[in-house]
Interface confidence: medium
């Protein structure tokens, strides 16, 4: 805590400017009016205050707004935002996308801090859903943002927001997250024609079921191996050799290099060796000729 001392004669601040940067802690506390600070917050970020001084300025704002800062102040916090704790931020009511952008700019180029995570959480909860403009903004600053959300949180993303998602935004998503996002993407892109649709849906296919992969195999999409390797194993296993060949097109040759990795390895184990041989890739490990394949899951369903 900064001790309360009288402001020396002639030092009372009439505006927030660079003349304050050589005020000692106690002089800042005594000579800067909190209300003046609040109305001239836009100046603070342009003045080279030290961290020690920023602590004093924050303390003054905390005293003025014990229930949380108003948005007019929050929008102009600048690098004073870095002095805020998640507890401070939980008191805020941030509704303007411009305010969010201004604060994210301060943290730009750095990993998401606990302050930023709390700010985003407050903002999204205040809006009720993750709309397109918000998602656009968040993924621009943090490409991995979507994949940091739980499947439950992702369920509040409206299909219209999916248009803002870029392939790199999904790089760190796990299958559970893609399971939630894929149906939204399918809905969002449903009116596009075949080749354009595939370009858009490709990054989401880690959440696609078998029947959708079968449908894609009929559309000459030429899926690359990197995309194929991210597909759900349980969705790939029922595909026939012919369907995989159609799905991959000229990229089918890449299966050889991936034959020891999932889902290719598990898929090979489910195919007849005769069928695999038709690919001419030397894939081994299929079901030998003359063996009967029992689908136990089907048998259980019937009984």
């Amino acid at each position: 805590e900064v001790e309360k001392t009288a402001c020396p004669s002639g030092k009372k601040a009439r505006e927030i400017d660079e003349s304050l940067i050589f005020y000692k802690k106690w002089e800042l506390e005594a000579c800067v009016d909190a209300a003046l600070l609040a109305t001239q917050m836009d100046r603070v970020n342009a003045i080279p205050f030290t961290y020690e001084q920023l602590d004093v300025l924050k303390h003054k704002l905390d005293e003025l707004y014990p229930q949380g800062y108003p948005e007019s102040v929050i929008q102009h916090l600048g690098y004073l935002f870095l002095k805020m704790s998640p507890e401070d931020i939980r008191k805020w009511n941030v509704t303007s996308l411009e305010t969010l952008k201004a604060l994210l700019e301060v943290n730009k180029g750095h990993e998401m801090s606990p302050q930023v995570a709390t700010l985003i959480d407050r903002f999204v909860k205040g809006r009720g859903q993750l709309d397109k403009d918000t998602l656009d903004t968040l993924t621009a600053f943090y490409p991995g943002y979507l994949c940091s959300l739980s499947p439950e949180e992702l369920s509040s993303v409206p299909p219209s927001s999916i248009w803002a998602v870029r392939p790199q935004d999904l790089d760190t998503c796990d299958p559970r997250q893609l399971d939630v996002l894929y149906p939204k993407a399918r809905l969002a892109f449903q009116n596009m024609n075949g080749s354009e649709y595939f370009v858009k849906i490709q990054s989401f296919l880690g959440g696609a079921p078998t029947e959708d992969l079968k449908a894609l195999s009929q559309q000459n999409v030429s899926m690359d191996l990197a995309t194929f390797m991210k597909l759900r194993t349980d969705a790939v296993l029922p595909l026939t050799v012919a369907e995989v060949q159609k799905l991959l097109g000229p990229h089918v040759e890449g299966l050889k290099a991936e034959e020891r990795h999932r889902p290719v390895r598990d898929w090979i184990l489910r195919q007849r060796q005769d069928d695999l041989d038709t690919l001419g890739l030397g894939l081994q490990g299929g079901i030998p000729n003359g063996y009967l394949v029992l689908d136990l899951s089907m048998q259980e369903a019937l009984s």
Partner: antibody, heavy 126, light 107 residues
Framework: QVQLVQSGAEVRRPGASVKISCRAS????????IHWLRQAPGQGPEWMGV????????????AYAQMLQGRVTMTRDTSTRTVYMELRSLRFEDTAVYYC???????????????WGQGTLVTVSS | DIQMTQSPSSLSASVGDRVTITCRAS??????SAWYQQKPGKAPKLLIY???TLQSGVPSRFSGSGSGTDFTLTISYLQSEDFATYYC?????????FGGGTKVDIK
């Protein structure tokens, strides 16, 4: 790439003044401050002051280290992206290499120096 | 003013050695410290800021640690180009101050 280019070496008599320039080139779009530091032979750098090199919401008036107050003035010419440091009433102990250096405003408050000028040797000699 | 006291003031080392330089602030400065390398006739070069963050383009053999009053610069495997003088700096409060330097020379 940012470059800070300083004016050449100066020799002055005690009591005289010297004015050094520092011109920024390259990508100077990032918001930053320009600081002046000096380094006497065999010593560590000594911070002299800071100036906002562009006009902005703040007044743009510079701030100086108290040990130099009254003798130093920092100014800027925004049209040429040049800042100046004038030191008056020179003393023998002001003999040093004078540097301008940049600090960026952003993630953190701006007080470590990511780019430096090449230095200007000021010799005070009778 | 905050004093930054560096130790040792000089040290001799060989290529491949692990070198540690320490800096003590006269009062707590959180993690608002930086480290610079300076070679004769050249300006200082930023190595580390925020006590432990490596500046872009600086080799990973340099690392920094510490918080509060005690800070350390470590060179994990000394290279021939690392023989120089190293300075710590605090940027918690004005005036910004530097340590007296540590000269690292060849054994």
């Amino acid at each position: 790439q940012v470059q800070l280019v300083q004016s050449g070496a100066e020799v002055r008599r005690p009591g005289a003044s010297v004015k050094i320039s520092c011109r920024a080139s390259g990508d100077t779009s990032t918001r930053h401050y320009i600081h002046w530091l000096r380094q006497a032979p065999g010593q560590g750098p000594e911070w002299m002051g800071v100036i906002n090199p562009t006009t902005g919401p703040a007044t743009g008036s510079p701030a100086y280290a108290q040990m130099l107050q009254g003798r130093v003035t920092m100014t800027r010419d925004t049209s040429t992206r040049t800042v100046y440091m004038e030191l008056r009433s020179l003393r023998f102990e002001d003999t040093a290499v004078y540097y301008c250096a940049r600090s960026v405003v952003g993630r953190s408050a701006p007080y470590y120096f990511d780019y430096w000028g090449q230095g200007t040797l000021v010799t005070v000699s009778s | 003013d905050i004093q930054m006291t560096q130790s040792p003031s000089s040290l001799s080392a060989s290529v491949g050695d692990r070198v540690t330089i320490t800096c003590r602030a006269s009062q707590g400065i959180s993690d608002y410290s930086a480290w610079y390398q300076q070679k004769p006739g050249k300006a200082p070069k930023l190595l580390i800021y925020a006590a432990s963050t490596l500046q872009s383009g600086v080799p990973s053999r340099f690392s920094g640690s510490g918080s509060g009053t005690d800070f350390t610069l470590t060179i994990s495997y000394l290279q021939s180009e690392d023989f120089a003088t190293y300075y710590c700096q605090q940027y918690y409060s004005y005036p910004l101050t530097f340590g007296g330097g540590t000269k690292v020379d060849i054994k």
